[in-house]
């Protein structure tokens, strides 16, 4: 779903139907520690020397909903995610580096502790480089490992 071409897409970006007390996880992994803002996430990444994983999504997007379920239920992804600073956003930031090829959702980007957006860590769709679908969990896991490995080689 491309949030740039849909008039009024921003109306979807509020958590309008919380079933439980809303947490920063927004259902992407309630046992994980999530940051609240992009600025906080960048600061934590730099000071902890951990890579940052940013998930852009919308509550009322079927593909965001579907990816969220497999992300939250995949034990390997949840375990590996503990090694990242985590942020999920239902709004767009002003940082254009976080939308290298458009403001579609869901998309996942990695940022290293030097605050460089890892534009080279991509999914498998040439028209939406940072998109992932439920069938892409193995690739997402590989990309998470790649982000961690690259971090280690940069130390």
């Amino acid at each position: 779903r491309d949030t740039t071409v849909k008039p009024g897409a921003k109306k979807d970006t509020k958590d309008s139907r919380p079933k439980l007390p809303q947490t920063l996880s927004r259902g992407w992994g309630d046992q994980l520690i999530w940051t609240q803002t992009y600025e906080e996430a960048l600061y934590k990444s730099k000071t902890s020397n951990k890579p940052l994983m940013i998930i852009h999504h919308l509550d009322e997007c079927p593909h965001s909903q579907a990816l969220k379920k497999v992300f939250a239920e995949n034990k390997e992804i949840q375990k590996l995610a503990e090694q990242f600073v985590l942020l999920n956003l239902v709004y767009e930031t002003t940082d254009k580096h976080l939308s290298p090829d458009g403001q579609y959702v869901p998309r996942i980007l990695f940022v290293d502790p030097s605050l460089t957006v890892r534009a080279d860590i991509t999914g498998r769709y040439s028209n939406r480089l940072y998109a992932y679908e439920p069938a892409d969990t193995a690739l997402l896991l590989d990309n998470m490992k790649k982000a961690l490995k690259l971090l280690k080689t940069e130390l």
């Epitope: 909903q65 497999v70 069938a135």
Partner: antibody, heavy 120, light 107 residues
Framework: QVQLVQSGAEVKKPGASVKVSCKTS????????MNWVRQAPGQGLEWIGW????????NYNGKFKDRVTLTADKSTSTVYMELSSLRSEDTAVYFC?????????????WGQGTLVTVSS | DIQMTQSPSSLSASVGDRVTITCKAS??????LSWFQQKPGKAPKTLIY???RLVDGVPSRFSGSGSGQDFTLTISSLQPEDIATYYC?????????FGGGTKVEIK
């Protein structure tokens, strides 16, 4: 193999409610979205909504939002679609349709359909 | 809601003919489009998902193409058992919406 078996035909009066069931087997029930679609006699297909049986999350077509409730019973691997305040234009065949095996949104397997007739 | 315009609404072709059905979305839906076959009195059967991926067990004479707003279902060589109504569905955005259907008959 994957099977979706729906409950039998129903005849209801205007203003009443109907609850259609879809009993599933042959896959991990909690990890595939279940959609509901209806088809009025001689007409096309219309999406009603979906539910994720793992946690009960739902999304409804705005047209039905105030009248439809989707639920799932993990103990029997069954999903339910309840439609209230029935009117004659709700006469249709109601289908359940499972999403992709990997949790993807596309509709992969269909139930055989349940005819609901609304008549006074 | 996204409108799905399917054409033609009906067609008549001979056995062995190449048949093409088109579906146009009112806005960009990426590749989130499926095609279904429905025979009278039966449930729909899924043929294709994500615009061009053939469902297991579906004959290879069926193929799908397109992305963005314009999509095509092709039957490379029409068989008697292909007589049915065909529907497209967009699942890019809620609510999911179907095309109006194309009834395929044998000449």
């Amino acid at each position: 193999q994957v099977q979706l078996v729906q409950s039998g035909a129903e005849v209801k009066k205007p203003g009443a409610s109907v609850k259609v069931s879809c009993k599933t087997s042959g896959y991990v029930f909690s990890r595939s979205w279940m959609n509901w679609v209806r088809q009025a006699p001689g007409q096309g297909l219309e999406w009603i909504g979906w539910i994720y049986p793992g946690d009960g999350d739902t999304n409804y077509n705005g047209k039905f939002k105030d009248r439809v409730t989707l639920t799932a019973d993990k103990s029997t691997s069954t999903v339910y679609m309840e439609l209230s305040s029935l009117r004659s234009e709700d006469t249709a065949v109601y289908f359940c349709a499972r999403g992709g095996y990997d949790g993807s949104p596309w509709l992969s397997y269909w139930g055989q359909g349940t005819l609901v007739t609304v008549s006074s | 809601d996204i409108q799905m315009t399917q054409s033609p609404s009906s067609l008549s072709a001979s056995v062995g003919d190449r048949v093409t059905i088109t579906c146009k979305a009112s806005q960009d839906i990426n590749s989130y489009l499926s095609w279904f076959q429905q025979k009278p009195g039966k449930a729909p059967k899924t043929l294709i998902y994500r615009a061009n991926r053939l469902v297991d067990g579906v004959p290879s004479r069926f193929s799908g193409s397109g992305s963005g707003q314009d999509f095509t279902l092709t039957i490379s060589s029409l068989q008697p058992e292909d007589i049915a109504t065909y529907y497209c569905l967009q699942y890019d955005e809620f609510p999911f919406t179907f095309g109006g259907g194309t009834k395929v008959e044998i000449k």
